[in-house]
């Protein structure tokens, strides 16, 4: 019974259960391909438990291996949009600190209006994740169509 | 050593490890866009540990944040079929209780025959998840092509 | 405090936190549709904590329910390429021991150049997972475009 009690008494953060699910706030101005995210119960079903938002980008607070997942749906899309503006690409990566900058996950919209994927990756406290959408396409802000999240899996 | 022993002695359900992976049973009658699911070791590799099925829909038994994932493949499909009948749309949502009804995840088959995605979302005991497939194309019942599951992640 | 200490003192493997994320090494010779994987910190962001590689295929070391995920991007590809060479199909399955051989997850590239999906499935110690890519198109070896991983979820 002791474990169950300990589990309840310790703050969840100390168990390493960092998790976040974000919804799209807005796209960047010209020359800024980043998507800007928001999260919190007041906004609906998005949340941050551990990680934080820094100017719309997700910052990691705990070292570990994370499952990173994303879905982006285009609000302005055509059967030829994806191929005409090709390659319209979504990339998720560590954008700061600069010394750790790397692309983690990349997908193109090939005659499709939605991309979705996920992967496991090591992240460190202070890593900021950016999601770059290249091309002149506008993502949907519907919370069931466009979302981005991370889940701490293990140290 | 105490933790390892405690972990083995306590029933897994008390650790909050609710998880389910379902396979397609059948589609609904006309005017009912829902997919009806089934699960259990007798059926193959599907299972329910915690959540339950209620008339083919998945009912949650434990409050928490869940990873919800789905893949649906259309049975009689080619790129041209998909675009002609397009957009066949799949939506996963809470359908009961009515007071909590909301769409959690939505995808269209855009000149493609498979959609797959996943997301983190808070769910409460008693929430029933429905998967609605709108359009005239039939989903495959192959267990490696069409499946739906949830995994409890944290309180 | 006792639980937190116990958690740190016990080897992670004893907590059942088996996890792996692999990057593509190479494709097989003719008549061998398997993708050959590699992993380890020296290679970048791939890793194996628990599972092992056996001639480029992933072997499971702990019984349990796993989340299996994969993304494969075709290297020389356009919407028309994908449909012209259609059906290029990716299947993830247990390939040994032969008695447990089964397809777990299957996807086709329909006018698209990337597939990504995930599913929960029971796996047993000794199961070897193979990823078969049928068709004449080559997968990208970029680590942000093609990857394959598993995460132990519960016993």
């Amino acid at each position: 019974q002791r474990f169950a009690q300990a589990q309840q008494q310790l703050p969840l953060e100390s168990l390493g259960w960092d998790v976040a699910e974000l919804q799209l706030n807005h796209t960047g101005p010209q020359q800024d391909p980043r998507l800007y995210w928001q999260g919190g119960p007041a906004l609906g079903r998005s949340f941050l438990h551990g990680p934080e938002l820094d100017k719309g980008q997700l910052r990691i607070h705990r070292d570990g291996i994370y499952m990173v997942h994303i879905q982006v749906t285009l609000a302005i899309c055509s059967s030829t949009t994806a191929s005409r503006h090709h390659p319209t690409t979504l990339a998720v990566g560590i954008c700061s600190p600069a010394s750790r900058s790397i692309s983690l996950l990349r997908l193109s919209f090939h005659q499709g209006c939605t991309i979705a994927s996920q992967r496991l990756t090591p992240l460190a406290r202070g890593d900021t994740l950016c999601t770059n959408l290249t091309g002149t396409l506008l993502p949907s802000r519907n919370t069931d169509e466009t979302f981005f999240g991370v889940q701490w899996v293990r140290p | 050593q105490r933790f390892a022993q405690a972990q083995q002695q306590l029933p897994l359900e008390s650790l909050g490890w609710d998880v389910a992976e379902l396979q397609l049973n059948h589609t609904g009658p006309q005017q009912d866009p829902r997919l009806y699911w089934q699960g259990g070791p007798a059926l193959g590799r599907s299972f329910l540990h915690g959540p339950e099925l209620d008339k083919g829909q998945l009912r949650i038994h434990r409050d928490g944040i869940y990873m919800v994932h789905i893949q649906v493949t259309l049975a009689i499909c080619s790129s041209t079929t998909a675009s002609r009948h397009h957009p066949t749309t799949l939506a996963v949502g809470i359908c009961s209780p009515a007071s909590r009804s909301i769409s959690l995840l939505r995808l269209s088959f855009h000149q493609g025959c498979t959609i797959a995605s996943q997301r983190l979302t808070p769910l409460a005991r008693g929430d029933t998840l429905c998967t609605n497939l709108t359009g005239t194309l039939l989903p495959s019942r192959n267990t490696d092509e069409t499946f739906f599951g949830v995994q409890w992640v944290r309180p | 405090q006792r639980f937190a200490q116990a958690q740190q003192q016990l080897p992670l493997e004893s907590l059942g936190w088996d996890v792996a994320e692999l990057q593509l090494n190479h494709t097989g010779p003719q008549q061998d549709p398997r993708l050959y994987w590699q992993g380890g910190p020296a290679l970048g962001r791939s890793f194996l904590h628990g599972p092992e590689l056996d001639k480029g295929q992933l072997r499971i070391h702990r019984d349990g329910i796993y989340m299996v995920h994969i993304q494969v991007t075709l290297a020389i590809c356009s919407s028309t390429t994908a449909s012209r060479h259609h059906p290029t199909t990716l299947a993830v399955g247990i390939c040994s021991p032969a008695s447990r051989s089964i397809s777990l997850l299957r996807l086709s590239f329909h006018q698209g150049c990337t597939i990504a999906s995930q599913r929960l499935t029971p796996l047993a110690r000794g199961d070897t997972l193979c990823t078969n890519l049928t068709g004449t198109l080559l997968p990208s070896r970029n680590t942000d475009e093609t990857f394959f991983g598993v995460q132990w979820v519960r016993p």
Epitope: T27, C113 | P87, T88 | -
Partner: antibody, heavy 120, light 108 residues
């Protein structure tokens, strides 16, 4: 109260140019994608162009691609449409319209329109 | 591009009657992303329905939308005097975003 007020229309010769403006008030302008939609006398509505809330992405109907340019100044809460190389078939009432918050181009608020007449 | 065909061109009805307006697409509309607007002479269009069946803010419940794929319907359950106008459907699933040419609902 959301308000959209177009201006800048008028009579112009074929090949000529105009700059249409749309002054917005009553909402956070930079949070919304905007479009121009036109309606020729007695004809159907036709979507012309769209721009994201930040101004970073622009979209055009094929009939105006290369001739029209959409832009916005979020500091002035104003949407613009620069129309060049005008043709007789561009004669229409031009409406500015706000996209739904989702960014999808269905239009929850419209201006009253400004008439552009292309004639020699 | 997706062509939207509205029928009938004109609908002559009396107040209190039920109006059924049809909009047919030349190909399936992605996500059932179809909207309905009302336009009165000299005025801008007004959004009634989006997503084929969701009523816009402030729209009376006598207006309802239905349909999916290629066939969509706007129903006005009991016509009020202020409902006599031209009604347009619009698909916004794929660019270019196209409108039907309207159904005029006039007093019989």
């Amino acid at each position: 109260e959301v308000q959209l007020l177009e201006s800048g229309g008028g009579l112009v010769q074929p090949g000529g140019s105009l700059r249409l403006s749309c002054a917005a008030s009553g909402f956070t302008f930079s949070s919304y994608a905007m479009s121009w939609v036109r309606q020729a006398p007695g004809k159907c509505l036709e979507w012309v162009s769209a721009i994201s809330g930040s101004g970073g992405s622009t979209f055009y109907a094929e009939s105006v691609q290369g001739r029209f340019t959409i832009s916005r100044d979020n500091s002035k809460n104003t949407l613009y449409l620069q129309v060049n190389s005008l043709r007789a078939e561009d004669t229409a009432v031009y409406y500015c319209a706000r996209h739904d918050y989702s960014n999808y181009p269905y239009f929850d608020y419209w201006g009253q329109g400004t008439l552009v007449t292309v004639s020699s | 591009e997706i062509v939207l065909t509205q029928s009938p061109g004109t609908l002559s009805l009396s107040p209190g009657e039920r109006a059924t307006l049809s909009c047919r697409a030349s190909q399936s509309v992605r996500g059932n992303y179809l909207a309905w607007y009302q336009q009165k002479p000299g005025q801008a269009p007004r959004l009634l329905i989006y997503g084929a069946s969701s009523r816009a803010t402030g729209i009376p419940d006598r207006f309802s939308g239905s349909g999916s794929g290629t066939d969509f319907t706007l129903t006005i359950s009991r016509l009020e005097p202020e409902d006599f106008a031209v009604y347009y459907c619009q698909q916004y699933g794929y660019s270019p975003f196209t409108f039907g040419c309207g159904t005029k609902v006039e007093i019989k």
